[in-house]
């Protein structure tokens, strides 16, 4: 009679939905490649740029073999949730010299919106909690400067492809587990 | 020129462990993973595992784990794999290759380092 | 984890005629779109040289004469025109799901 009214509907295969959230995660790691080269083409990078309200890297030399299910799903849907308010603050506040890549960015938060929910599904099939961030939402003021903008994007866009190659990790190493 | 070279052939007894070193130029080394595979005489490549070099993270093929120990020195652009419990199986040519964030191929590869292990 | 099997195991071609190489996967390494099949050429004493990409995308400095197809399970990779250099033995990989596995390899020799 399947479970009752209410209650998350638990997945009968939950490698194939993982497997949905792995395709969607390394679509989103293709495209994001590919708007980080196109960024540096456009605007050659000086170094390593960073940004202090990015979530930092989840992932560290120890953490990848103790992962557990609920706390990739949960620490990653934290911190796309954050890159989607750093994409959409750039596409706001990134100014004239972001404007050519406004196509990207907009197809990138596309895509990443539709990893987010696919996230959420695949939390509530296996019914685990829909966390909310520790830590208050900061909000995110104007760059100082065109530059500013710029060495944001980098930032952003590095970061996004760091945490989206964690994930794929993460995930597929968990799938063996399953 | 993108570029990975290795350290030279290693004769070890059983039982010992061996490390390779792997020196990355002519690119970013953060912007890929380093993999690390095993082509022993007659066998087909085995991936072993690979680290990404940002955050230090390796992953491991289960037949290698517990044995086998990725790290990267960043500021030199070095990775490199330990091989502990030495057995006669391990008689093997070991490559390194820059990984594909995410997708696992294999674009540039060291020339490889034999490892031979005998009594 | 994915079994890929290779065929034929070996290949006597003359340079000039084309080649075509086949990998079989134990369970299906495509999805939506992308298939996680890649492809290597090794000569004897040197490392692999990735030639193809996600089943059909040639890798840069690769000759155009090399093609690969596919998904699935079943996937090809074609030389049309064999060149002299082209005598070697070719890996198919996937990367579908960890871990990545290859093939047993195709050697194709000159006849």
């Known amino acids: 009679p399947g479970p009752p009214a209410g209650s998350p509907r638990v997945s009968s295969d939950p490698r194939a939905d993982l497997d949905s959230a792995v395709l969607l995660t390394r679509s989103l790691l293709a495209d994001t490649r590919q708007l980080a080269a196109q960024m540096r083409d456009k605007f050659p990078a000086d170094g390593d740029h960073s940004l202090d309200s990015l979530p930092t890297l989840a992932m560290s030399a120890g953490t990848l073999g103790s992962l557990q299910l609920p706390g990739v799903l949960t620490r990653l849907r934290v911190d796309l949730m954050s890159y989607l308010r750093h994409v959409q603050w750039l596409r706001r506040a990134g100014g004239p010299s972001l404007k050519t890549l406004e196509p990207e960015l907009g197809a990138l938060q596309a895509r990443l919106e539709r990893l987010l929910r696919r996230l959420q599904l695949l939390m509530s099939r296996l019914a685990l909690p829909q966390a909310a961030p520790d830590q208050p939402v900061i909000p995110l003021g104007p760059p100082a400067s065109a530059w500013g903008s710029i060495r944001a994007a980098h930032a952003i866009l590095g970061g996004l492809h760091l945490t989206l190659d964690w994930a794929v990790r993460g995930l597929l190493l968990l799938k063996t587990r399953l | 020129e993108v570029q990975l070279v290795q350290s030279g052939a290693e004769v070890k007894k059983p039982g010992a462990s061996v490390k390779i070193s792997c020196k990355a130029s002519?690119?970013?080394?953060?912007?890929?993973?380093m993999d690390w595979v095993k082509q022993a005489p007659g066998q087909r490549l085995e991936w072993i595992g690979d680290i990404n070099p940002h955050s230090g993270g390796p992953i491991y093929n289960q037949k290698f784990t517990g044995r086998a120990t990725l790290t990267v020195d960043k500021s030199a652009s070095t990775a490199y794999m330990e091989l502990s419990s030495l057995r006669s199986e391990d008689t093997a040519v070991y490559y390194c290759?820059?990984?594909?964030?995410?997708?696992?191929?294999?674009?540039?590869w060291g020339q490889g380092t034999t490892v031979t292990v005998s009594s | 984890d994915i079994v890929l099997t290779q065929s034929p195991a070996s290949l006597a071609l003359s340079p000039g005629e084309r080649a075509t190489l086949s990998c079989r996967a134990s369970?299906?390494?495509?999805?939506?779109?992308?298939?996680?099949i890649h492809w290597y050429q090794q000569k004897p004493g040197q490392a692999p040289r990735l030639l193809i990409y996600?089943?059909?995308n040639l890798d840069s400095g690769v000759p155009a004469r090399f093609s690969g197809s596919g998904s699935g399970t079943d996937f090809t990779l074609t030389i049309s025109s064999l060149e002299e250099e082209d005598f070697a033995t070719y890996y198919c990989?996937?990367?579908?799901?960890?871990?990545?596995?290859f093939g047993q390899g195709t050697k194709l020799e000159i006849k």
């Open positions: 996600l089943a059909s």
């Open positions: 290759a820059r990984g594909e964030l995410g997708h696992w191929y294999f674009d540039v």
């Open positions: 990989q996937h990367s579908r799901d960890l871990p990545p596995t």
């Open positions: 002519g690119y970013t080394f953060t912007d890929y993973n």
């Open positions: 369970k299906s390494v495509s999805t939506s779109g992308y298939s996680y």
